[in-house]
């Protein structure tokens, strides 16, 4: 007996040969002896019911005169999985269909950190193993259902499982998208007084996009985190709901998600939540967003610089005068120069010598009253 | 071709009413935005209100807001706007537009002419 | 509400010139930035969207650059049908607001 692979929903192709490699009289039939198509010498295809129903099974007429009388069997079912006979020169082959199918638990948009469910139907009497590859190449096996936890955006795009069953294979492809934002964390570094944009692009594209999203912000200085803004989001057109007075926020209109603060200033500086919470899906997106903003200062005879904001202990804090070395360099947010000498001063903030954030300041000669005799 | 025809301008005294609409062909009517956009004589373009595509939010500039209605109806392909409290400076040209799928009022009609006077 | 500022308000160019109009937003609007171009007793006619994109059958003659704060409208080679008003429209959020206007005449 023959066995053949099909996929539901895809065509299966069931081989009868002839020994003659000519056109001959062949007929398919189901086991119980139902006639499903053949060809009695005409060379004219003759089925064996209503159109209707038997409009998913055909032959290759070109392959006819070659001695091949395939039964193709199109948009496969789950019940197609049965014997199937071809009679032919006085015998009778019999060849074995077994349709599978493997489906994505519930959804194939599923949010970051969600688990992933695939499961594999097969026909009874059959014991495939199941393997699927992820698009990040790793590999997980199973019985008839395959589960991966903790989803990550590495793991959005097509998915491979290879269904094995009597040293045959039939290879699924489903397209899995992750939801999530491009970035799960971002900073920005910006001097007191300059304007700041907060950008929260996704990384997936829908053709319609509905939700509702809220930016909270736990500044620095603040005992408690505040609702900066809150927006809906429908199909993909972003519309603010309620905005703080201070800060004044200014929201755009279209994806990516786009937020515009006028001014940094020390007591904004701090770290921000965005959640997204996208209609017909548990569970929200989320990005951290940081702010960090520098002061420089000079107040009587001290020169003064401060950063405000969630800094990493290695970054450095140095006061230097322009195109010197460094006056005073520290693992500190808040650093100063007494008596600094006249020219441009610069404050600056970096990381393994790359800077992140500068900030210049003229000192201006100080004129001292010469003291009389 | 994507059309679209403004109908309903005219003279009005102060604190009148007045309600435009505008005829869209072409296109797909439902699912764009579609705006009112105005031009006072010899001066530059001022946006007046947008309602977005079958949502149905809606949008108005602050000289306007509480005074006019932007609506549409979309079995009819027609985009209205509703003017109450009509003041002298709501005098202009009034274009209809609509939006692209980019958000961009890409199309505009050749604009009926309101007239607030006593 | 954000502001728009274009500059020049009006210039005077011969047919061939390359003309540049700049347009100024009062905070950052990334590329949601538009250009419309009015002839007089007419409706305004849309040329370039996203501060780049040239709107289908615009002559290639128009380009478009800028991103934030600052935006560029640039005819390379003035024909006579460009004597025209160009206006910048921010398109970043509500209320949408468009530049004064630049005048585009003939030397």
């Known amino acids: 007996k023959t066995l053949v692979l099909g996929k539901e929903g895809e065509s299966a192709e069931l081989p009868c040969e002839s020994s003659q490699k000519k056109i001959t009289v062949f007929t398919w039939k189901f086991s119980d002896q139902r006639k499903i198509l053949g060809q009695h010498g005409k060379g004219v295809l003759i089925r064996g019911g209503s159109p209707s129903q038997f409009d998913r099974f055909d032959s290759k007429k070109g392959a006819w005169e070659k001695g091949s009388f395939p039964l193709i069997i199109n948009k496969l079912k789950m019940e197609d999985s049965q014997t199937y006979i071809c009679e032919l020169e006085n015998r009778k082959e019999e060849v074995e269909l077994w349709v599978f199918k493997v489906t994505a638990n519930s959804d194939t948009h599923l949010l970051q950190g969600q688990s992933l469910t695939l499961t594999l139907e097969s026909p009874p009497g059959s014991s495939p193993s199941v393997q699927c590859r992820s698009p990040r190449g790793k590999n997980i096996q199973g019985g008839k259902t395959l589960s991966v936890s903790q989803l990550e955006l590495q793991d959005s795009g097509t998915w491979t499982c290879t269904v094995l069953q009597n040293q045959k294979k039939v290879e699924f492809k489903i397209d899995i998208v992750v939801l999530a934002f491009q970035k799960a964390s971002s900073i920005v570094y910006k001097k007191e007084g300059e304007q700041v944009e907060f950008s929260f692009p996704l990384a997936f594209t829908v053709e319609k996009l509905t939700g509702s999203g809220e930016l909270w912000w736990q500044a620095e200085r603040a005992s408690s985190s505040k609702s900066w803004i809150t927006f809906d989001l429908k199909n993909k057109e972003v519309s603010v709901k309620r905005v703080t007075q201070d800060p004044k926020l200014q929201m755009g209109k279209k994806l990516p998600l786009h937020l515009t603060l006028p001014q940094a200033l020390p007591q904004y500086a701090g770290s921000g939540n965005l959640t997204l919470a996208l209609e017909a899906k548990t569970g929200k997106l989320h990005q951290e967003v940081n702010l960090v903003v520098m002061r420089a200062t000079q107040l009587q005879k001290n020169l003064t610089c401060e950063v405000w904001g969630p800094t990493s202990p290695k970054l450095m804090l140095s006061l230097k005068l322009e195109n010197k070395e460094a006056k005073v360099s520290k693992r500190e947010k808040a650093v100063w120069v007494l008596n600094p000498e006249a020219g441009m001063w610069q404050c600056l903030l970096s990381d393994s010598g790359q800077v992140l954030l500068e900030s210049n300041i003229k000192v201006l000669p100080t004129w001292s009253t010469p003291v009389q005799p | 071709e994507v059309q679209l025809l403004e109908s309903g301008g005219g003279l009005v005294q102060p604190g009148g009413s007045l309600r435009l609409s505008c005829a869209a062909s072409g296109f797909t009517f439902s699912t764009y935005a579609m705006s009112w956009v105005r031009q006072a004589p010899g001066k530059g373009l001022e946006w007046v209100s947008t309602i977005s595509d079958n949502i149905g939010n809606t949008y108005y500039a602050d000289s306007v807001k509480g005074r006019f209605t932007i609506s549409r109806d979309n079995s009819k392909n027609t985009l209205y706007l509703q003017m109450n409290s009509l003041r002298a400076e709501d005098t202009a040209v009034y274009y209809c537009?609509?939006?692209?799928?980019?958000?961009?009022?890409?199309?505009w009609g050749k604009g009926t002419t309101v007239t607030v006077s006593s | 509400a954000i502001q728009m500022t274009q500059s020049p308000s009006s210039l005077s160019a011969s047919v061939g010139d390359r003309v540049t109009i700049t347009c100024r937003a009062s905070q950052g609007i990334r590329n949601d930035l538009g250009w419309c171009q009015q002839k007089p007793g007419k409706a305004p006619k849309f040329l370039i969207y996203a501060a780049s994109t040239l709107q289908s059958g615009v002559p290639s003659r128009f380009s478009g650059s800028g991103y934030g704060t600052d935006f560029t409208l640039t005819i390379s080679s003035l024909q006579p049908e460009d004597f025209a008003t160009y206006y910048c429209l921010q398109d970043y959020n509500y209320p949408r607001t468009f530049g004064q206007g630049t005048k585009v005449e003939i030397k």
């Open positions: 537009t609509k939006d692209n799928e980019d958000y961009y009022m890409d199309v």
